[in-house]
Every structure is written in structure tokens, then in C-alpha cells.
């Protein structure tokens, strides 16, 4: 297993609709054809997997149907979007990139993006 540098923004504020997008960029040392991207959430000392996708270079990322993540790739950059976020989901989201094929296997983990989520103000009751 070889180490690889992964860069991601330090802080992002999600939209009022609970959507946060950020780029995860990795310094690929070779010509990988198969890449796996995993988003991890760290809260206190607990780390949980948010979503993961494996893609072939040049193809779209495919997350599971019920995943809260979507993404696109361009070269060594992956543009990740996490939706359905609530205020309680505020936390550190870490991008993990694995170059699966061809060998050698490379692993890179970013410093994390602190995502802040603001619950929208409830709409005032309307008199209908």
C-alpha cells in the first residue's frame, strides 16, 4: 500500500436546502483506471461511512440507489455532492481515495471538510 496526497476544502457551508458540494483532488502517481472514493464522517472519535463509489476513469461515479451522495469525476478531481443534510449532520467529512487498478494499490485520505448545515427557518403558518 502506497500513500497518496488528497486535498479537499477545509470548510463548507451547505445550502439552505441541505446540499453540500466539494471537490476531492488526489495526486495520482500513475495511470489508474479504477478508482474508489469513500466519504467518511468523523464525529467526536467515531468514524462512519457516508457513501462510497467505484468508477472507471472517464466514467461517471455510481453510488448505490439509496445513497445521499452523487458525484462526477474529471481527471484527478472528484466533485462530490451530499444531499438531505440536517443541522445535526454538521461535522467533518473526510475524502478517502483508493487507486484500485492497475497495481500498485495507492491510498490517500484528506484532512476532511468541516460541513456546517443550517436547518431552514420553518415557514410561518398561512391562513387558508
Amino acid at each position: 500500500c502506497k500513500a497518496m496526497h488528497v486535498a479537499q476544502p477545509a470548510v463548507v457551508l451547505a445550502s439552505s436546502r441541505g446540499i453540500a458540494s466539494f471537490v476531492c483532488e488526489y495526486a495520482s502517481p500513475g495511470k489508474a483506471t479504477e478508482v474508489r472514493v469513500t466519504v467518511l464522517r468523523q464525529a467526536d472519535s467515531q468514524v462512519t461511512e457516508v457513501c462510497a463509489a467505484t468508477y472507471m476513469m472517464g466514467n461517471e461515479l455510481t453510488f448505490l440507489d439509496d445513497s445521499i451522495c452523487t458525484g462526477t469525476s474529471s481527471g484527478n478531481q472528484v466533485n462530490l455532492t451530499i444531499q438531505g443534510l440536517r443541522a445535526m449532520d454538521t461535522g467533518l467529512y473526510i475524502c478517502k481515495v483508493e487507486l484500485m487498478y492497475p497495481p500498485p494499490y495507492y491510498l490517500g485520505i484528506g484532512n476532511g471538510t468541516q460541513i456546517y448545515v443550517i436547518d431552514p427557518e420553518p415557514c410561518p403558518d398561512s391562513d387558508f
Epitope: P9, A10, V11, V12, L13, A87, T90, Q114, Y116
Partner: antibody, heavy 118, light 110 residues
Framework: EVQLVQSGAEVKKPGASVKVSCKAS????????ISWVRQAPGQGLEWMGW????????NYAQKLQGRVTMTTDTSTSTAYMELRSLRSDDTAVYYC???????????WGQGTLVTVSS | SYELMQPPSVSKGLRQTATLTCTGN????????ADWLQQHQGHPPKLLSY???DRPSGISERFSASRSGSTASLTITGLQPEDEADYYC???????????FGGGTKVTVL
């Protein structure tokens, strides 16, 4: 070296607006946020709101909602805070602070004194 | 009024130990912890301690932070004249969707 340099002192009349700038250097501006904090004479620190330089999204303190606007110009790595309908109790030193990894206010500007007086 | 409660002042002798407290609730300090800032008269605040109780580089080991439940503490050992300053705690409040400050504690070194 990370630096946040703010614009100079301002004297304004009640009802007017003020726009304070905060020019950042020494880091990738769009990877971080900028928070604004004010301090009235002899008082403690009050959080006003923040902007994510990455996407321009903002989050304002409830009590200032509707009177404050925070923006960034990523081409010059500068953040702005505009406060409207100024009152005498808005007299304060206004600070910008970088919101860093983990959401820490890790670097601060030197402060801008805004005096509201008729 | 401040969401986080800090004693207004603490006085200790030279080379003594001062412990500052910051009490919040489960939405702020109890949830994420608190950061500590030091502010000398006429200067901007400076980050002293991260909410995970680590120190930024360049901050003396004499400053150490801890947390128990919804109360964060900052301990200053071997007090020096230059430690005379205002100390603020700061936390993200998940229910207010806002950062909240404590009212500050003025530390006097006798």
C-alpha cells in the same frame, strides 16, 4: 504566512451603512471561511455571521438578519461585511477571522473601529 | 446575554495555577466542545486551544483545555505577567445554527 488585513476606521451617522473589507493572503482563500465578530467598547465578543468562501453561502446571527450582508471576491481574496441602518449601539471594533479546519477561528484581522455618531 | 457562562474575573499570584470554566449545554459545549481565545487589551483575539483540546503551534504548554459534560475548562499553569488578558470560550450551537461566545473572563496576575 497567513494574514488578514482589514480596512481603516470609519465614522458614520445613524441610519447610514458601512462596508468593511478583509484581505486574505498566505493561504488558498476558497478552501476556508470568513467569520465576522464585533466588540463594543469595554464589552465581550459577539459573533455576527460567516461566509463560506468555497461557495459563497452565508449564515448570519439572528439579531442581525436583514441588516448585514457578507460577500467575498475570490479574484482578490477579499471578504466584505456590510451593515445597514446603523445605530449608536453598532459602535464597535469589527474583526474578521478565518474559519479553518474543524471550524476554528484560527487567524484574525487587526480590527476595524466603526463609530456611529450624529 | 451570553449562551456560554464564564466567571467575569479570576485573580491568582505569579507562578500559580488558574482554572477558567465555560458552561454551556448539550447543543454547544456538550456536543462539540469549546475553543479558547486570549485577548490582550487593544489587540485582536488569538486562538489558544482547539475544541479537541489540542493547541495551535506556538502556544505554550502552560495552557491546557479539557471538557466534562457541558463544561469546558482552561487551565493556565505557572502564571506569568503576560497571561494577564481576557479569555473567551467559543462553541458552535447546533440548535441555534450559530457560533456562541462566553462573556469572557478577565485574568489578573497578582
Amino acid at each position: 504566512e497567513v494574514q488578514l488585513v482589514q480596512s481603516g476606521a470609519e465614522v458614520k451617522k445613524p441610519g447610514a451603512s458601512v462596508k468593511v473589507s478583509c484581505k486574505a493572503s498566505g493561504y488558498t482563500f476558497t478552501s476556508y471561511g470568513i467569520s465576522w465578530v464585533r466588540q463594543a467598547p469595554g464589552q465581550g465578543l459577539e459573533w455576527m455571521g460567516w461566509i463560506s468562501a468555497y461557495n459563497g453561502n452565508t449564515n448570519y446571527a439572528q439579531k442581525l438578519q436583514g441588516r448585514v450582508t457578507m460577500t467575498t471576491d475570490t479574484s482578490t481574496s477579499t471578504a466584505y461585511m456590510e451593515l445597514r441602518s446603523l445605530r449608536s449601539d453598532d459602535t464597535a471594533v469589527y474583526y474578521c477571522a478565518r474559519v479553518g479546519y474543524g471550524g476554528y477561528f484560527d487567524y484574525w484581522g487587526q480590527g476595524t473601529l466603526v463609530t456611529v455618531s450624529s | 446575554s451570553y449562551e456560554l457562562m464564564q466567571p467575569p474575573s479570576v485573580s491568582k499570584g505569579l507562578r500559580q495555577t488558574a482554572t477558567l470554566t465555560c458552561t454551556g449545554n448539550s447543543n454547544n459545549v456538550g456536543n462539540q466542545g469549546a475553543d479558547w481565545l486570549q485577548q490582550h487589551q487593544g489587540h485582536p483575539p488569538k486562538l489558544l486551544s482547539y475544541r479537541n483540546n489540542d493547541r495551535p503551534s506556538g502556544i505554550s504548554e502552560r495552557f491546557s483545555a479539557s471538557r466534562s459534560g457541558s463544561t469546558a475548562s482552561l487551565t493556565i499553569t505557572g502564571l506569568q505577567p503576560e497571561d494577564e488578558a481576557d479569555y473567551y470560550c467559543l462553541a458552535w450551537d447546533s440548535s441555534l445554527s450559530a457560533w456562541v461566545f462566553g462573556g469572557g473572563t478577565k485574568v489578573t496576575v497578582l
